[in-house]
């Protein structure tokens, strides 16, 4: 299985650090590691460490994605993994860049049809569910890159080959170029790029900025649409509350989305959806007689 | 080892629903898909659908998108199918099954399969 | 849906000699990895399926060296040399190209 491939490759990475809770010491803070009889110094960041089994997750989720989508059986899982440890492997966490992802990036190449993209903000549990309906459809994470990551965190440590298990750099506390901050910055620069036509975006409509210039949709994705190929971004804002009728397409949020998106000569459209367990069932049973009716 | 354990036969109405399990050892069950056939009696093998365990996704032939519900339970490392509206059509044999990893390719082929589960449809 | 199509043996064969049995897929198999998506396998009676074969010509691990696999695109064969009585069984053959994957409806072995 993946974890014999692993023993066999003798991956190194820091065994049962999982089990080491240190205290925080401050934002890149260094302390002891190691019952040795000289200590080993080692950065702590303030957010959570890499995922515990991080290779083998990639590994197995690279194999999967290439079991259940045929149309990607040519590309060698081993190269994935080995492109996406040299991006962050030996690098300081805080100076990583869009360029250590270019070797991942080229191998994770895919071409999805670029009018059936759907971008998702504070939402991402719907949006999915979606796709996983709408099978035409596809989000970030329903292409190869973006469901090997998905959910995951990792960082390295500048001139050693570990992977630190105990701690991150949080993208508010510590930095912003680190090495899942700046994956996700890439990947959805690319996905962005790479849309046409109508482009579909969900939003939150229960959080107080439905749009948030700060989010990854906002400060990435939004302006990376190229107005030559799209013609249309098309919100769709998700309603929470039960009895929560009101036109959240007039909230200042989406105007100023509207705005955006207006200047940078793309067209804009919005739509509430009231009853995102109703529209997720009309998804699946379009034929059902209470789906003419608004959603 | 890798072991793939069915739920014991069931009988179901015309018109019910039954629900089968296959739990998962020897193996880290969210690293691998599942995969669902259906053997009808003296016929040959149908692949119904597959689950990824690790994010629930599913995916189902054309013919069973409306019979079939594929779950898992990562708790217990178990996956389930559900067939509703059981007609004597859904009387069968149905087995769990799962691809071998090749030095990080997928085989492509079922490996591993459960020891299949009878379901008899009757009034 | 890609469509499958095995052909019948004479039966029964005789113990110690040699069998094949072929498959036809209404499209190639041949991915542009360079692996042709075609497996084999055995259902022994009462049984569950057995993979013998995958990727057209590979043996799955544990399966005896007698059986062997061939083919090209579309036109493929197992061979089982100096068949065993522990042979008997319905053998399938399957492309894992593209979903949903799709069997051949079997084909019979039975030992003289």
């Known amino acids: 299985g993946l974890n014999d491939i692993f023993e066999a490759q003798k991956i190194e990475w820091h065994e049962g650090s999982h089990h080491h809770h240190h205290h925080h010491h401050g934002s890149g803070s260094l302390v002891p590691r190691g019952s040795g009889s000289v200590p080993r110094w080692r950065q702590q960041w303030s957010g959570p460490g890499t995922t515990k089994r991080f290779p083998e997750t990639v590994l197995a989720r690279c194999v999967k994605y290439t079991e259940i989508h045929p149309e990607m059986r040519h590309v060698d899982c081993q190269s994935v993994w080995d492109a996406f440890k040299g991006a962050f492997i030996s690098k300081h966490p805080c100076n990583i860049t869009e360029e250590d992802y270019q070797p991942l990036m080229k191998l994770g190449t895919q071409t999805v049809p670029c009018n059936k993209i759907l971008l998702w903000s504070r939402i991402k549990d719907l949006a999915h569910q979606f796709t996983q309906v709408q099978r035409d459809m596809f989000t970030l994470e329903d292409t190869l890159l973006g469901y090997l990551a998905d959910d995951l965190t990792w960082c390295g440590e500048f001139n050693t080959s570990k992977i630190n298990y105990q701690s991150c750099p949080d993208w508010r506390k510590d930095c912003s170029n680190n090495p899942v901050s700046v994956f996700w910055k890439t990947v959805s620069r690319r996905f962005a790029e790479a849309a046409c036509d109508v482009v579909h975006v969900m939003l939150n409509g229960s959080r107080s900025k439905i749009f948030d210039k700060n989010s990854t949709f906002g400060s990435v994705e939004v302006h990376n649409l190229q107005p030559e190929k799209v013609q249309t971004l098309e919100a769709w804002v998700i309603h929470g509350g039960r009895e929560d009728s009101r036109d959240l397409c007039q909230d200042p949020t989406i105007k100023e989305l509207e705005s955006i998106i207006s200047k940078r000569n793309i067209q804009f459209s919005c739509k509430n959806i009231y009853r995102p367990d109703k529209f997720l069932q009309c998804v699946k049973n379009p034929e059902d007689s209470s789906c003419t009716s608004e959603i | 080892e890798v072991q793939l354990q069915q739920s014991g036969p069931e009988v179901g109405r015309p018109g019910s629903s039954v629900k089968i399990s296959c739990k998962a050892s020897g193996y880290i069950f969210t690293d691998y898909i599942m995969h669902w056939v259906k053997q009808s009696p003296g016929q040959g093998l149908e692949w119904i659908g597959w689950i990824d365990p690790e994010y629930g996704s599913t995916d189902y032939a054309e013919k069973f998108k409306k019979k079939a519900t594929l779950t898992a339970d990562t708790s217990s490392s178990t996956a389930y199918i559900q067939l509703s509206s059981l007609t004597s059509e859904d009387t069968a044999t149905y087995f769990c099954a799962r691809v071998a990893i090749i030095t990080t390719v997928a085989s492509g082929g079922f490996a591993y399969w459960g020891q299949g589960t009878l379901v008899t449809v009757s009034s | 849906d890609i469509v499958m199509t095995q052909g019948a043996l004479p039966n029964p064969v005789p113990s110690g000699e040699s069998a094949s049995i072929t498959c036809q897929s209404s499209?190639?198999?041949?991915?542009?990895?360079?692996?042709?998506?075609l497996n084999w396998y055995l259902q022994r009676p009462g049984q569950s399926p057995q993979l013998l074969i995958y990727w057209m010509s590979t043996r799955a691990a544990g399966v005896s060296d007698r059986f062997s696999g061939s083919g090209s695109g579309t036109d493929f064969t197992l061979t089982i040399s100096g068949v065993e009585a522990e042979d008997v069984g319905v053998y399938y053959c399957?492309?894992?190209?593209?979903?949903?994957?799709?069997f051949g409806s079997g084909t019979k072995l039975e030992i003289k």
């Open positions: 499209e190639s198999l041949l991915h542009s990895n360079g692996k042709t998506y």
């Open positions: 399957q492309q894992f190209l593209e979903y949903p994957p799709t």
